[in-house]
Structures are given as C-alpha cells and as structure tokens.
Interface confidence: low
C-alpha cells in the first residue's frame, strides 16, 4: 500500500481540517513552549506544502517521509536553543533518530502558566470574533500541556468544545449554560489524557507484547461473544493505532484508529451486540463511543477453563509450539469470564500461569506439576478485593475530602521525597476512586477501582522519572507494570527518610486563601498536611487531625474577620506554635 | 493475522449429508483443539464438536452424536466436519473456533437443511 506521496496520502484521507488540527497537535506536543502564532504560521507553511503534494505527487521534497517533513519544519523554529536547550541538538541527527530525541525530550510537567478562564463574555466574543483561532488556541493549549494526548480524542473534545459555545453564546444565561460543559470537558479531558498516558508508558517502558496483553483482557471482557481470531486481529490494529500516536506519527494514527472503527461497525455481528448505536454517530463520536462501549452479555454455558489449560494433556505441547498464541488463548478465555476483574489482575493471572508452565513443562511430570495452578490464583483475587472493600468502607466513613487527607498522609509516609505538589495531585486523584468506584456494585468494582488507580500511579511514575528523588518509587514503576498498584500499597513507612527541617513560611497564610473556590482551598489545606507529615512522619493520625481541625477553624475565623491579614497574621503565629507543641516539633 | 476460512455449506435435503471444511492460517494449527460452533436464525450460538491438537480426543455435543464426525489434518491445516443424516433443525451457519469456545469469529458457511 505505497503510496508516491506520504503527506499527500494524509490530507486526502483526512481532509484539511483534520489535517491542520492534527498537524497543529503534533507541534504543540512536541514544542511545547513555542507561542501560538509560531506554531499556526508552521502549521499553514506545511498545509500549503501538503496541498501542493496533492496537485503532483511528484513535486519536489513530496516524497519524504512525515517525519522528516515535520522534524525539518521544527528545526526551523529561531529560538529553538534558547527555549528548549538541549532539545536543539536533535536537530544535528537524522531520521529516524531524530524524531526519537524529540519524543524523549516530552515533558510531562511543563512550566506553564495555570490556565485561568476569562468571563463567559468575554470567551463568547473571542469565540464569535474568529471561530476557527478560538478553536485552534484549545487544541494547542491543551496539546502542549498533555504531550501524549490521544489526537483523535482531541478533535472528539474540539467538535465538543465548538458545539458548547455554538449552543450556551446564544443562551439567555450563557454562564449557566456554558460552566457546567466547560468543567464536564477538563475532568474528561485530564481523565482522557491520564488513560493515554498509561497506554503509551505501558508502550515505551514494557514493549508491544504488554500493549497487546492488556489489550487482549480488555477487549476479550468488552467483547465475550467475539472469537479469539477476531479479537486477536483487533488488537493487532489498536496496538498499531497507539504505538503510532504514542510515537508522534497523529495523521497515521488518526487515519488507521478511523479504519478500525469502520472495521469493527461493517463486522459488528461477530464482535459485540452493544455496538449499534455507537455505529451510527459521525466518525469522531463514533470511535470515542466504542472506545467506551459497554461490556457485551458474556455467552451463556461457556465450558470450563481447565479442560483446555490443566487437564488436556497436550497443555505443555501448545504453551511450546506457540507460547504468545497459547498464552494469549488463555487470557482471552479468562478474560471473557471475568468482566468483574480488573484488566491488571487478568494479566497477573496469566503472568502466573505462564511461570508455571514454563516450571513446570521442563519437570519430569508436568501434569502432576500444573494440576493445581489454578489454585495459586486465589490469594492474587483475594487481594485487591479485600483492598477494596476496606477501602470504600473507609471512604463511606469519610467522604471525598477526608479520604484524600487519608491516602495524602498514607503516600506521604510511604514515599517523603516526592515533591509535595505531585504528592497532593496524585493523592486526590486515587481519592476520587472513592466517589468514581465505590458506588457500583461488587461485580463492577474492581474493574473500576483498580484499573483507575492504574492510570493514576502511572501519573506518579511518569513524574517522579523527570525529577527522581526515591528509590521505592522508581523499584515499583518499574520492576512490572501489572503489579505497580500491589507494590506500592504493600510500601510500608519510610524507616530511612530524615524528617525535614521546620520552616514557618510553609505554614504562613493570607487573606487571599478567602477567595480562593473550595477546590483550591481544600489543595492549600492538603499541602500543608503534607508538609506536616513530612516535617513529623511518626505523628499518629489523631494529632494530625487535630492541626488540621485547627488549621479549618483558623482559616474559617479570619476569612469572617473584618481586617483579614491582621488576623492570618497573629492567628497563624498562634496556630503555628500549638501545632509544633501538639506535633512535638 | 489468525484466520479461519470455512466452505462446503450448501442446500441438502433432510437426510443428506454434507462435508465443511475450515482453512487456518496464522497461528500454529497443530497446537491448538478446534471446534465448530453453529448458530441458527434468531438464535445463540451453540457449540458442535470439538477435537483435540493431534485428533484423538473427539467430543459432541447430543444431538449431532453419531451422525457428525469431526476431523483434521495438520499438514494442510485444515479443520473437518463430516455432516450425515441431517436434520432441519441442523439448518444454521456453521463456523469453526479455536479452542472450545462457543463464540462465534470468521464469516462461518450456511447450511441449509429442506424439502
């Protein structure tokens, strides 16, 4: 399927303004501190370029790859060397090198302003002034502060992000329209970028074969009725569809994830009953819909999973004549039966069956050998269920807010080193395990639960890798991936960690906490629980309650006052000094 | 790329027979047991037949029990189901699976059992 012309090939299939976008994507994930208009003037620079490719394949530079197409259009940025320092040398290698440095040089962290939302009318004047810059400053805003966002997802959240203001600037109260979509599409988004993020770390750090492992139990659950040969082609497609967008190559991705979407809705028939509706919609609210399509019913009288895989006496002949096949059989199968696991404990169980297989078929009895392998498997189930229903009791117990603090002052303990912003982004993001899982019934549970705090600790693991600072962190984040979330939770207090030094100013606060919304109010309040269990690692939970119960009261109380920085002042002084004689310190 | 290609479907007239075949490719035929799988319109799919990797161990599901014979052969990786005296209420799309799923994959073969 060669075509003369790769970029050509692209904007005919995509169209221009799939093109632009996703060109204007890539840019802005690759140099992230660029300003906009640079990136806009490079992005129409290429458009006219690819334009000219559709007229005559054959023109000059049409027959170069995408990469380094693009790789030459970001080396021409002028003040590539005083932004990105290093980064400018990538521009000294060839392709395919060069493209390598430039991924390697993604940052998951960027020094970027906070974006801040202007008023309703303010954003509904710039939307009408110029539609289409409106919509290309999202898109980039966005791309450069997720750099692994999933492109084709993000055209599905522009398309959403238009339709929002095409509706809500017309509205009688276009705040009360407007606000409610805006924050439903960041907490979609942030959510969406963080499930990209493990798809492309599980990727880059643990290779193809755990992409398509995980890729296998998930689908085999989502589609039970779909036969291992169809499962196995559509994991070869999506792994081909990640691998490309995890890589930077967005219009192949876009392209091939469009193709796959067509695939699966001509032969939904022998995939999943659930996929009807989701086939029907546009191209971008289609494949966003079954990407999240609902588990299909599993077929009724499924056989038992031993006779193919402990009592067939042929077991260890196919794990050796086709070790991936075999093992890929196997997490189907089980993967099928157990919509009630999460995707990570299916693949521990496989990971477990292929340990002992690989034991056990070099014995002198195998079969004697393997017999009872699947009795191995209840401790590895047992877990994460006990993990979670103490954990939802405790989040019953405690709502939201204080079941964050929990974990805060839980990770804090476990792991002082971590910066306490990424401490306090990750904590409250497991905290919301509690409101997102623990709602479902048991049979929908651990699937929720514990492939969310997956993606979570991912955001950790990704992190800490730019900045290091403990070791327990990079062991868990890297010694396997399906164990990620049992690693760190079996991470007991850090025995060798050197509390810090006090320091007042940490715990200095003004009157600008009083307008701050209460989601800001609650971060201010659980980066100084950070800090004090940082400065105190041996302190029980009940002293920590009381400072914070203290800290809640003081903040209330000068927040009524009349002269508010008077009171931040001398109350704070006061309650500095009785959280060090409470705490010891 | 697993594929399965199965053939030899057709119109038979109660008491007939008929001989599927189903073409692997892509996966390592010989290590694997292999079933056939039917499902008639309007209803779920029910599995037939299963065989072992080297075809000794055979198994059938009542109703097909001695009138249908399943079959191999590795060197042509190819996957058999001997049909005789067949019944209208065999008339269903037959597909051949890997393992002993139940589930349906490839575009299966109609079979069609009339007067």
């Known amino acids: 399927d060669a075509h003369k012309s790769e970029v050509a090939h692209r904007f005919k299939d995509l169209g221009e303004e799939n093109f632009k976008a996703l060109v204007l994507i890539a840019f802005a994930q690759y140099l992230q501190q660029c300003p906009f208009e640079d990136h806009v003037k490079l992005v129409n620079e290429v458009t006219e370029f690819a334009k000219t490719c559709v007229a005559d394949e054959s023109a000059e530079n049409c027959d170069k790859s995408l990469h380094t197409l693009f790789g030459d259009k970001l080396c021409t940025v002028a003040t590539l060397r005083e932004t990105y320092g290093e980064m400018a040398d990538c521009c000294a290698k060839q392709e395919p090198e060069r493209n390598e440095c430039f991924l390697q040089h993604k940052d998951d962290n960027p020094n970027l302003p906070r974006l801040v939302r202007p008023e309703v009318d303010v954003m509904c004047t710039a939307f009408h002034d110029n539609e289409e810059t409106f919509l290309k400053k999202y898109l980039y805003e966005i791309a450069r502060r997720h750099p692994y966002f999933y492109a084709p997802e993000l055209l599905f959240f522009a398309k959403r992000y238009k339709a929002a203001f095409t509706e809500c600037c017309q509205a009688a109260d276009k705040a009360a329209c407007l606000l409610p979509k805006l924050d439903e599409l960041r907490d979609e988004g942030k959510a969406s970028s963080a499930k990209q993020r493990l798809k492309c770390a599980s990727l880059q750090k643990f290779g193809e074969r755990a992409f398509k492992a995980w890729a296998v139990a998930r689908l085999s659950q989502r589609f039970p009725k779909a036969e291992f040969a169809e499962v196995s082609k559509l994991v070869t497609d999506l792994t081909k569809v990640h691998t490309e967008c995890c890589h930077g190559d967005l219009l192949e991705c876009a392209d091939d994830r469009a193709d796959l979407a067509k695939y699966i809705c001509e032969n939904q028939d022998s995939i999943s009953s659930k996929l009807k509706e989701c086939c029907e919609k546009p191209l971008l609210e289609k494949s966003h819909c079954i990407a999240e399509v609902e588990n299909d019913e599993m077929p009724a009288d499924l056989p038992s999973l031993a006779a193919d895989f402990v009592e067939s006496k042929d077991v260890c002949k196919n794990y050796a004549e086709a070790k991936d096949v075999f093992l890929g059989m196997f997490l189907y199968e089980y993967a099928r039966r157990h919509p009630d696991y999460s995707v990570v404990l299916l693949l521990r169980l496989a990971k477990t069956y292929e340990t002992t297989l690989e034991k056990c078929c070099a014995a002198a009895d195998p079969h004697e050998c393997y017999a009872k392998v699947f009795d191995e498997f209840k401790p590895l189930v047992e877990e994460p269920q006990n993990l979670i229903k103490q954990n939802c009791e405790l989040f019953e117990q405690l709502g939201e807010y204080k079941f964050q603090n929990a974990l805060l002052v839980r990770y804090t303990k476990k792991v002082p080193q971590v910066s306490t912003p990424t401490l306090v982004e990750v904590s409250r993001n497991l905290g919301k395990v509690g409101s997102k899982c623990c709602k479902h019934p048991e049979a929908k549970r651990m699937p929720c639960a514990e492939d969310y705090l997956s993606v979570v600790l991912n955001q950790l693991c990704v992190l800490h890798e730019k900045t290091p600072v403990s070791d327990r962190v990079t062991k868990c984040c890297t010694e396997s991936l399906v164990n990620r979330r049992p690693c760190f939770s079996a991470l007991e207090v850090d025995e060798t960690y050197v509390p810090k030094e006090f320091n007042a100013e940490t715990f200095t606060f003004h009157a600008d906490i009083c307008t701050l919304s209460e989601k800001e109010r609650q971060i201010k309040k659980q980066t100084a629980l950070v800090e004090l269990v940082k400065h105190k690692p041996k302190a029980t939970k009940e002293q920590l309650k009381a400072v914070m119960d203290d800290f809640a009261a003081f903040v209330e109380k000068c927040c009524k006052a009349d002269d508010k920085e008077t009171c931040f002042a001398e109350e704070g002084k006061k309650l500095v000094a009785a959280s060090q004689a409470a705490l010891g310190l | 790329q697993v594929q399965l290609v199965e053939s030899g479907g057709g119109l038979v007239q109660p008491g007939g027979s008929l001989r599927l075949s189903c073409a692997a490719s892509g996966f390592t035929f010989g290590s694997f047991g292999m079933s056939w799988v039917r499902q008639a319109p309007g209803k779920g799919p029910e599995w037939v037949s299963a065989i072992d990797s080297g075809g000794a161990d055979t198994r059938y599901t009542e109703s097909v029990k001695g009138r249908f014979t399943i079959s191999r052969d590795n060197a042509k990786k190819t996957l058999y189901l001997q049909m005789n005296s067949l019944k209208p209420e065999d008339t269903a799309v037959y597909y051949c699976?890997?393992?002993?799923?139940?589930?349906?994959g490839s575009q299966g073969t109609q079979v069609t059992v009339s007067s």
């Open positions: 699976t890997i393992g002993r799923s139940i589930s349906r």
